[in-house]
Amino acid sequence: ATKLTEEKYELKEGQTLDVKCDYTLEKFASSQKAWQIIRDGEMPKTLACTERPSKNSHPVQVGRIILEDYHDHGLLRVRMVNLQVEDSGLYQCVIYQPPKEPHMLFDRIRLVVTKGFSGTPGSNENSTQNVYKIPPTTTKALCPLYTSPRTVTQAPPKSTADVSTPDSEINLTNVTDIIRVPVFN
């Protein structure tokens, strides 16, 4: 069975979060996709969405968020550039499918942004997380206002955390520290 999980990214201010959400391309290739933040006790808030219908590998930029939907691969790429401490939180990708509720994608992203000079020689931030180049064309898309009332808005209690990093090289990748945590619905 598919497990809903969280992956934790610990980044410094100014860095770029660069992640992907996969979906069943036969079902959702041209559906509108969105990037949402889930704040404790609140409804998920849509921060950016693709066009409707979603265009293949056509970057959409909303502020510091860039979405790129690779239809033919069933992948939505999400980049949040120039991260700020206030960006810390729980994020998810969803697929809009009116009149039905949005379809939530795996995995959720727990983003922790800390203050600190990024890209110092010898630090573990010497990676593509620092680097961002603006796509040649960007467009803004209007996002539907509705969100799913049934979306879980609480992080799992600390006791359920299952830090699955059996092979220690995950901490040596310079991507970030990523912790996988099952979320129980």
């Epitope: 598919t2 497990k3 999980t5 992956e7 660069d18 992640v19 992907k20 959400c21 996969d22 979906y23 069943t24 391309l25 590998s57 790129e68 690779y70 033919d72 691969h73 069933g74 992948l75 790429r77 980049r79 795996f106 995995d107 992203i109 010497n126 990676s127 593509t128 680097v131 961002y132 180049k133 699955s164 059996p166 092979d167 090289e169 995950i170 990748t173 310079n174 991507v175 970030t176 990523i178 996988r180």
Partner: antibody
């Protein structure tokens, strides 16, 4: 340690299908995408596509899209790549590969490779 | 699709030599570039990721540099065990593509 062990060499006739298996050990199978890369004899590397073992979703490059199927059995930590309508130019070594970072990261660095499976297509 | 062009396609060098392989992308790929080493009959091995980061366990004589469209892979002092074919690979977008490879031989 991380290990990807692939099934043995196959000889197939043109038009047939082949299913290559890739058994993972030494890590949580559902936490990392599996990719497939092939290499024709004496040629370079060619990326075929990816699969997320947790969701079961997969994607492949255009030239293989109608012929390739990537699946998995999470209970035995095994990924599969099936290629149908084989032709002589599909003769190659097929590798399953695990990425460096967890499946949500845009980090397509091929860190752990299977030993390869030679598929020969000949009439 | 992004084309990756490696040069030279083959080179011969002596033990102790400094060896440089270049990889050029058909458009800006930032630092989304990896380098692999493949010995005959073996699977490739990741050597450098994100243009300049040395993979764990890879000797420090190997290094990578560059960003945008031009990248360099360097072996500071060639050793007999470095004889292999080296490939670059981008992941700036989908599809992922590899360079055609550079075959390195000992003089």
């Amino acid at each position: 340690q991380v290990q990807l062990v692939q099934s043995g060499a196959e000889v197939k006739k043109p038009g047939a299908s082949v299913k290559v298996s890739c058994k993972a050990s030494g890590y949580t199978f559902t936490s990392y995408d599996i990719n497939w890369v092939r290499q024709a004899t004496g040629q370079g590397l060619e990326w075929m596509g990816w699969m997320n073992p947790n969701s079961g979703n997969s994607g492949s490059v255009k030239k293989f899209r109608d012929r390739v199927t990537m699946t998995r059995n999470t209970s035995i930590s095994t990924a599969y790549m099936e290629l149908s309508s084989l032709r002589s130019e599909d003769t190659a070594v097929y590798y399953c590969v695990r990425l460096i970072g967890y499946s949500s990261a845009w980090k397509w660095s091929f860190q752990h490779w299977g030993q390869g499976t030679l598929v020969t297509v000949s009439s | 699709d992004i084309q990756m062009t490696q040069s030279p396609s083959s080179l011969s060098a002596s033990v102790g030599d400094r060896v440089t392989i270049t990889c050029q992308a058909s458009r800006d790929i930032s630092k989304y570039l990896n380098w692999y080493q493949q010995k005959p009959g073996k699977a490739p091995k990741l050597q450098i990721y994100d243009a300049s980061n040395l993979e764990t366990g890879v000797p420090s004589r190997f290094s990578g540099s560059g960003s945008g469209t031009d990248f360099t892979f360097t072996i500071s002092s060639l050793q007999p065990e470095d004889i292999a074919t080296y490939y670059c690979q981008h992941y700036d977008n989908i599809p992922i593509t590899f360079g055609q490879g550079t075959r390195l031989e000992i003089k």
